[in-house]
C-alpha cells in the first residue's frame, strides 16, 4: 500500500514547477503574485 | 531573430554609478520579463534583477538590492540597470536576458564589461 | 537555503557519451532546473529545463544529442556523440517564489574537455 508521506510528497512534487510557471506568466501578464 | 546588446559598461571608481543599457530587436520587447545576470572574471553567473513586461514589478538579490534598480522603456525597446554606490566586487561581465513561457533565461545578450576600481 | 553543487571539471573522448550532474540541496529536491552551456569567450546560452520526472525542453537550436533524466536531488545533462564544439563550461541553474520575493541561483558549473 502506498503511505500517506509519500501521497503527500507525490502530490507536493511539482508545486515548486506550479510557481514557477505562474511566475513566467506573471513576469508577461502582471499578474499580482500574492 | 532575438537581439540583446548591452553597453555603458567601462571602468568606474568605487562609490560611483553606472548606468547600462540593452538594446532589443527580433521580438515584441514590451511582451516579456527581462533581467541582468552578471559573472565575474573567472567565477559563476550571479542573477541580479528581473523586471515584468510593462515594468510594474522589480526583483532583485540581497547582494544588489537599494544599490540597483532595473528600468525598461518599452517605447524604446531597451532595458537598463542604474548601480550606484558601486563596490569593487561588482566587477564583472553583465548580461541582459529575456524569458520566454517556459524559462527565465532564453536569450542572452553578448555582455558588457563593468570594472570597479580607484 | 536554495544550493546547486556541480562537479568543476569533467573529461571525455570524442564520440563518447557525457553525463554531467547537478545536485540540488536536498529540502528542495523536486524542484524543476535549467541548464546552460557557455563556450569559451562566449555569452551563456539556454540548453533546457529539466524536471523532478525527467521531462525536459529544449532551447533553440539545440542537438538532440543533449537530453536531460533525473533521479532525487540529481539532475543529469546527457551529451552523446560528443563533438569538439560541446567543450564549454555546463551550468546549472534554479529560481523559485517566496513571499512575493524571486530567487534564483546558479551552480558553479562543470568545464566539459573533449579529449582527441
Known amino acids: 500500500a502506498v503511505s500517506e508521506h509519500q501521497l503527500l510528497h507525490d502530490k507536493g512534487k511539482s508545486i515548486q514547477d506550479l510557481r514557477r510557471r505562474f511566475f513566467l506568466h506573471h513576469l508577461i501578464a502582471e499578474i499580482h503574485t500574492a | 531573430q532575438v537581439q540583446l546588446v548591452e553597453s555603458g559598461g567601462g571602468v568606474v571608481q568605487p562609490g560611483r554609478s553606472l548606468r547600462l543599457s540593452c538594446a532589443a530587436s527580433?521580438?515584441?520587447?514590451?511582451?516579456?520579463?527581462m533581467s541582468w545576470v552578471r559573472q565575474a572574471p573567472g567565477k559563476g553567473l550571479e542573477w541580479v534583477a528581473t523586471?515584468?513586461?510593462?515594468?510594474?514589478?522589480?526583483y532583485y538579490p540581497d547582494s544588489v538590492k537599494g544599490r540597483f534598480t532595473i528600468s525598461r522603456d518599452n517605447s524604446k525597446n531597451t532595458l537598463y540597470l542604474q548601480m550606484n554606490s558601486l563596490r569593487a566586487e561588482d566587477t564583472a561581465v553583465y548580461y541582459c536576458?529575456?524569458?520566454?513561457?517556459?524559462?527565465?533565461?532564453?536569450?542572452w545578450g553578448q555582455g558588457t564589461l563593468v570594472t570597479v576600481s580607484s | 537555503q536554495l544550493v546547486l553543487t556541480q562537479s568543476s571539471s569533467a573529461s571525455f573522448s570524442l564520440g563518447a557519451s557525457a553525463k554531467l550532474t547537478c545536485t540540488l540541496s536536498?529540502?528542495?529536491?523536486?524542484?524543476?532546473i535549467e541548464w546552460y552551456q557557455q563556450q569559451p569567450l562566449k555569452p551563456p546560452k539556454y540548453v533546457m529545463d529539466l524536471k523532478q520526472d525527467g521531462s525536459h525542453s529544449t532551447g533553440d537550436g539545440i542537438p538532440d544529442r543533449f537530453s536531460g533524466s533525473s533521479s532525487g536531488a540529481e539532475r543529469y545533462l546527457t551529451i552523446s556523440s560528443l563533438q569538439s564544439e560541446d567543450e564549454a563550461d555546463y551550468i546549472c541553474?534554479?529560481?523559485?517564489?517566496?513571499?512575493?520575493?524571486?530567487?534564483?541561483?546558479f551552480g558553479g558549473g562543470t568545464k566539459l574537455t573533449v579529449l582527441g
Open positions: 536576458a529575456r524569458q520566454t513561457t517556459m524559462t527565465y533565461f532564453a536569450y
Open positions: 523586471i515584468s513586461s510593462g515594468g510594474s514589478y522589480t
Open positions: 541553474g534554479v529560481g523559485d517564489t517566496i513571499k512575493e520575493q524571486f530567487v534564483y541561483v
Open positions: 527580433g521580438f515584441t520587447f514590451s511582451s516579456y520579463g
Open positions: 536536498s529540502q528542495h529536491s523536486t524542484y524543476t
